[in-house]
Amino acid sequence: LQDPCSNCPAGTFCDNNRNQICSPCPPNSFSSAGGQRTCDICRQCKGVFRTRKECSSTSNAECDCTPGFHCLGAGCSMCEQDCKQGQELTKKGCKDCCFGTFNDQKRGICRPWTNCSLDGKSVLVNGTKERDVVCGPSPADLSPGASSVTPPAPAREPGHSPQ
């Protein structure tokens, strides 16, 4: 015998108390599949959450975060405060990255600069709070005659024409 509830479409619930008729989900609730005996209460995007997608009778609302915050967790279950680049969020708020670390995003933690010497390379561009160091060729590669990097042209003295 087929379960009579299997005929109830998404957006309805199968009402055991009314001879298993299909009743529509009330406002602010939904059922995303057929044959359900209950409707799920819609998520409400309140406070720091804002509605990205309204709830319908067949699908839940989706939330994101108000400006200055970003989503964390599955389905944006939490909103976390943004910080500036070069900072990380601590229990006491946004704090600048310590020397030797950087963060190039508005979220996440400060990470240590790359240690170029571990790869046998030299530092081409120093790191900042916002940016990692840029590693260049190894010091051996910079020996005369072996360099693959064109050395910068010497600066010209003002008022002199090239010789």
């Epitope: 108390n17 009330p26 406002p27 209950t38 409707c39 209460i41």
Partner: nanobody, 120 residues
């Protein structure tokens, strides 16, 4: 931590009315369906009804003597019981869930209950 507190129970005579209240502390009812269950001595728990978003769903034992309503300002849900009968004697529990109706659902939270006795 959510706490649900029922009140309004007591001993009444057949044919009388009672209004039970369910108040929530620690959280509002805003995002929950609120249900009522009852359990008579030596019997299984019985579903009374569920309220959500202006709609009420009732158990199959009773169609028109019981009415569930809600006062958003007071964060309270009510169970109005009219023309009470001796077989309505039970402990009445308020519960909340993210499901509607709660007829086949294990609630997320449930109160301690309030005793209703109907006796002449």
């Amino acid at each position: 931590e959510v706490q649900l507190v029922e009140s309004g129970g007591g001993t009444v005579q057949p044919g009388d009315s009672l209004r039970l209240s369910c108040a929530a502390s620690g959280r509002t009812f805003d995002n929950y369906a609120v249900g009522w269950f009852r359990q008579a001595p030596g019997k299984e728990r019985q579903y009374v009804g569920t309220y959500w978003s202006g709609y009420a769903h009732y158990g199959d034992f009773e169609n028109n003597r019981f009415t569930i309503s809600r006062d958003n300002a007071k964060n309270t849900v009510y169970l109005q019981m009219d023309n009470l009968k001796p077989e309505d004697t039970a402990v009445y529990y308020c519960a909340i869930s993210l499901k509607y109706p709660m007829a086949t659902v294990t609630p997320d939270y449930q109160g301690q209950g309030t005793q209703v006795t109907v006796s002449s």
